[in-house]
Amino acid sequence: ESALITQQDLAPQQRAAPQQKRSSPSEGLCPPGHHISEDGRDCISCKYGQDYSTHWNDLLFCLRCTRCDSGEVELSPCTTTRNTVCQCEEGTFREEDSPEMCRKCRTGCPRGMVKVGDCTPWSDIECVHKESGTKHSGEVPAVEETVTSSPGTPASPCSLSG
């Protein structure tokens, strides 16, 4: 059985990184875009485009930047204070319950339903029953039941890199 609990000092060890900017921690914390040195004496800047930290922190390292997958587009690059922002390519979307991959949007609604919402990077097309106006469950209909409402953009599934 092993262990994370309370109070013991780290053996001091100086961090050798002369190419990175240093400053002193403020009340034991370093500003966004920095992490703390192994001995706790210095704040060391993150490397632009490689790693980042978003808040005041005492992290022992900056966090690695996310790399957008081939099925994604990069909305904004990684900076020292913000991670990369990736978005599913046109015609694909990422669901909350399966955030690790972009799924292809349906090209149309089942028979008897009408499209009320377009494919977006975060949602599939939205279908409702013509009469009742209730939402479709989101299950992909059989091909022969599909009523095409827009051509849709073919796209391959993608994995969210971590």
Epitope: S2, A3, L4, I5, T6, L10, L59, L60, L63, G162
Partner: nanobody
């Protein structure tokens, strides 16, 4: 009950290699960051390496970077540390630990070893 059982330590000559393992049980292993920490004789706990929950991101303290490799098998609930080019200053008891995020200075500074924790002894000596 959370259990972390380390193994694979031993006596090795400088320049030699060892592979440490940590068998985890009692929690959802794949949801947690995992660390290796060590305690040299008469010294405090020292963070060695960390790996995120999915295993895609690995981090090392400066003195072991390029020599040690951390990895995990989320199907076997096991954490590993491959230690190459060992030096006398790597001599310590090595422990694995679970956490909800990356290691911070304050977290490592306030870490202690549970009385029941065994760790695995690594001795580098000629």
């Amino acid at each position: 009950e959370v259990q972390l059982v380390e193994s694979g330590g031993g006596l090795v000559q400088p320049g030699g290699s060892l592979r440490l393992s940590c068998a985890a049980s009692g929690f959802t292993f794949s949801r947690y960051w995992m660390y290796w920490v060590r305690q040299a004789p008469g010294k405090g706990l020292e963070w060695v390496s960390a790996i995120n929950s999915g295993g895609g991101d690995t981090y090392y303290r400066d003195s072991v970077r390029g020599r040690f490799t951390i990895s995990r098998d989320n199907f076997k609930n096991t954490l590993y540390l491959q230690m190459n080019s060992l030096k006398s200053e790597d001599t310590a008891v090595y422990y694995c630990a679970k956490a909800e995020g990356p290691p911070t200075f304050s977290l490592i500074r306030t870490m202690t070893v549970d009385p029941g924790a065994q760790g695995t002894q690594v001795t580098v000596s000629s």
